[in-house]
Interface confidence: low
Amino acid sequence: GITIPRNPGCPNSEDKNFPRTVMVNLNIHNRNTNTNPKRSSDYYNRSTSPWNLHRNEDPERYPSVIWEAKCRHLGCINADGNVDYHMNSVPIQQEILVLRREPPHCPNSFRLEKILVSVGCTCVTPIVHHVA
Amino acid sequence: GITIPRNPGCPNSEDKNFPRTVMVNLNIHNRNTNTNPKRSSDYYNRSTSPWNLHRNEDPERYPSVIWEAKCRHLGCINADGNVDYHMNSVPIQQEILVLRREPPHCPNSFRLEKILVSVGCTCVTPIVHHVA
């Protein structure tokens, strides 16, 4: 692959654990303006597999607030507005990166952490397992 | 709110931009074992609003690989397996944090960036707008 030369203007790393410990500017470059998922779309209500959004807060994590989706039904909403159990509402999950304060309560020292969050729900055809 | 005292074992911050610039340990604590979304579930294929997963790679970003969902159809799959345009397949989007190398090509200096990614698709009842 292409090797990109190191930028001569990079900060020096004086940390013994380098390259595991790096400097991160927390002044976020945000390409998006809307951070409240309830405002950004009403899909959670209009979906055939609707979900509720739960606020998960943790002051030792950055971002401290994460919204978690929980499917409202086991089945999916059919054309008549009823729950159809021939189909299943399932959460769509994604691994995201967060920063965890380490050591705890430190304002300027973090460790990267991967967590699995449910973003919304989708309606799937169930896998029917036949009993042997 | 509760004020948590600063841990006396925290690293000192000698950076003029503190608290914007922090130390981050990239040795990820991963609570999940499966990182390939295609392996983690086959919902993308079984959904009534199926999607394809596209690999988005950027060596200046951490993580360098992100999977983006694109809905396969404008409508949703009905019980007969046909696309039904009385319903709409829509992407479920989420803001995630990534690290962007800053200055570019630096191995040990990053800036936090928020990006919007499509995680999967869900089937929604359309908002039917009457033409004025």
Partner: antibody, heavy 118, light 110 residues
Framework: EVQLLESGGGLVQPGGSLRLSCAAS????????MSWVRQAPGKGLEWVSA????????YYADSVKGRFTISRDNSKNTLYLQMNSLRAEDTAVYYC???????????WGQGTMVTVSS | NFMLTQPHSVSESPGKTVTISCTRS????????VQWYQQRPGSAPTIVIF?????PSGVPDRFSGSIDSSSNSASLTISRLKTEDEADYYC?????????FGGGTKLTVL
């Protein structure tokens, strides 16, 4: 009242680029999918591209795939079409349209003329 | 991709009824909505029928749409023709990832 106003058309040489804009008003822009449709002089309508209300899904006609990019800025109520590697056959009036539902162009702008010629 | 085929032109006298057909080359027309657009000379198109047979408010009830699954075709019927109906008419439908217009039919009101 729904209003769609296209701009950015003009004369460009083959291989050149142009960015069309469509300023929308009179409705909640982010709730609607939007499309671009073009019409070559004396010819019929040709669908070019569509984008979902959130901007998360985009679709293109085969004739423009890889050359044109549709995007939207919901904070500015504006739809865009970035056109690169333009060809003579891209010469047309370009209309932006608000979709009733996906692919159903309920309201149209008055169009902007793009001429690709050396 | 599929195609939508329309007659190049049709003509009829004022007060009469005219029907414009639109045939889909492949894929069931019944699975996808059909729209009809009117375009008068020098103007942008306007929708006259959407979702096979739905009429937007402001469009006279002289305009109606239908589909025939057996022939995989759609029709636009305009009754009690008026001179102001003279225009080009386009049918339009979908495939899963794209939108397709018919070639257009020029309606002349004699």
């Amino acid at each position: 009242e729904v209003q769609l106003l296209e701009s950015g058309g003009g004369l460009v040489q083959p291989g050149g680029s142009l960015r069309l804009s469509c300023a929308a008003s009179g409705f909640t822009f982010s709730s609607y999918a939007m499309s671009w449709v073009r019409q070559a002089p004396g010819k019929g309508l040709e669908w070019v591209s569509a984008i979902s209300g959130s901007g998360g899904s985009t679709y293109y006609a085969d004739s423009v795939k890889g050359r044109f990019t549709i995007s939207r800025d919901n904070s500015k109520n504006t739809l865009y079409l970035q056109m690169n590697s333009l060809r003579a056959e891209d010469t047309a009036v370009y209309y932006c349209a608000r979709d009733l539902i996906w692919g159903v162009a309920g309201s149209w702008g008055q169009g902007t003329m793009v001429t690709v010629s050396s | 991709n599929f195609m939508l085929t329309q007659p190049h032109s049709v003509s009829e006298s004022p007060g009469k009824t005219v029907t414009i057909s639109c045939t889909r080359s492949s894929g069931s027309l019944a699975n996808y909505y059909v729209q009809w657009y009117q375009q008068r000379p020098g103007s942008a198109p306007t929708i006259v029928i959407f979702a096979n047979n739905q009429r937007p408010s402001g469009v006279p009830d002289r305009f109606s749409g239908s589909i025939d699954s057996s022939s995989n075709s759609a029709s636009l019927t305009i009754s009690r023709l008026k001179t102001e109906d003279e225009a080009d008419y386009y049918c339009q439908s979908y495939s899963p990832h794209s939108v397709v217009f018919g070639g257009g039919t020029k309606l002349t009101v004699l």
